[in-house]
């Protein structure tokens, strides 16, 4: 039975040209995290593999930095970066846990962070 929950940074906003940290945290399970995927809609941005470390997709290498921790830093944000991001935790023995973050990239200087929320 899967007992874990993923806590994410929820709905967040950031300024065009700036940076943002996407963060997820898996709790309430003793399962071993074997790999964390960061995905945007139908694209793979980066992977942190327990054995192989971080790998960034070639098309995002210039704008994506690993960390902090299992999180992901997006840099030089554009309005096209607005959308859903997913952290996918592959764990053993539990299986897969998925967290969702919605990022809005704003033209203006008004960018506020949303509240945290949980996905069971």
């Amino acid at each position: 039975m899967m007992t874990g929950t993923i806590e994410t940074t929820g709905n967040i906003s950031a300024e065009k040209g700036g940076s943002i940290i996407l963060q997820c945290h898996l709790s309430s399970t003793t399962a071993q995290v074997t790999q964390v995927n960061w995905e945007q809609q139908d694209q793979l941005l980066a992977i942190c593999n327990a054995d192989l470390g971080w790998h960034i997709s070639p098309s995002f290498k210039d704008r994506v930095a690993p960390g902090p921790g299992l999180g992901l830093t997006l840099q030089s944000l554009t309005v096209n970066d607005t959308g859903e991001y997913f952290c996918i935790y592959h764990t053993y023995p539990d299986g897969t846990y998925t967290g969702r973050i919605f990022l809005e990239v704003l033209e203006s200087s008004v960018a506020e962070h949303g509240a945290r929320f949980q996905i069971p």
């Epitope: 593999n49 192989l52 790998h55 592959h90 539990d94 299986g95 897969t96």
Partner: antibody, heavy 122, light 110 residues
Framework: EVQLVQSGAEVKKPGSSVKVSCKAS????????ISWVRQAPGQGLEWMGG????????DVAEKFQGRVTITADTSTNTVYIELSSLRSEDTAVYYC???????????????WGRGTLVTVSS | QSALTQPRSVSGSPGQSVTISCTGT?????????VSWYQQHPGKAPKLMIY???YRPSEISNRFSGSKSGNTASLTISGLQAEDEADYYC??????????FGAGTKLTVL
Amino acid sequence: EVQLVQSGAEVKKPGSSVKVSCKASGYTFASYGISWVRQAPGQGLEWMGGITPFFNRVDVAEKFQGRVTITADTSTNTVYIELSSLRSEDTAVYYCARDLRRGGVGDAFDIWGRGTLVTVSS
Amino acid sequence: QSALTQPRSVSGSPGQSVTISCTGTSSDVGSHNYVSWYQQHPGKAPKLMIYEVSYRPSEISNRFSGSKSGNTASLTISGLQAEDEADYYCSSYTPSSATVFGAGTKLTVL
């Protein structure tokens, strides 16, 4: 449309080698691992190994280590398996299969090639 | 010899439900949720029906369901139809030994 297209049937002599190809299309090739699964006539499925182009990581089942080489050509979106020192028991249909999830976790396969029959006979 | 034990054959009449079992050990099926089921018609490639014990790919009918109890995983097919006649294979995945398949079960629709 996501698909895996495999090379044609082969007839080989015992002791020789065979190389089967699997060309992927319709998705971002490097993001998904591809495994090779074989099926001898009238028998069950047997996982041989797989490759994750994203990491360029290759895993081979213990039974086939030393006899199997799996490679990927990202310029043509093609994965290859080469099996050496062939014997009659290697006669089988060889399938390539794509991982269900990105990143090469390899626990389930959602897209399969149509299979390549390799016959080993003297 | 496969590490996962399946019955050689099962059968059922149209409209009935059938269950196919897949028995492993406390080291594989009993210890994790990475159990998948595949359907294979004669001369065709396998098709993924269930993954992670009980999850169905979006295109698979909800007549197919998966479950697990102890060291045994099960595939249940309800409202049996003629086109369900096929071979069914379970598989178990562990990061160390990768994927192992069961020997397969032939389902006959009477």
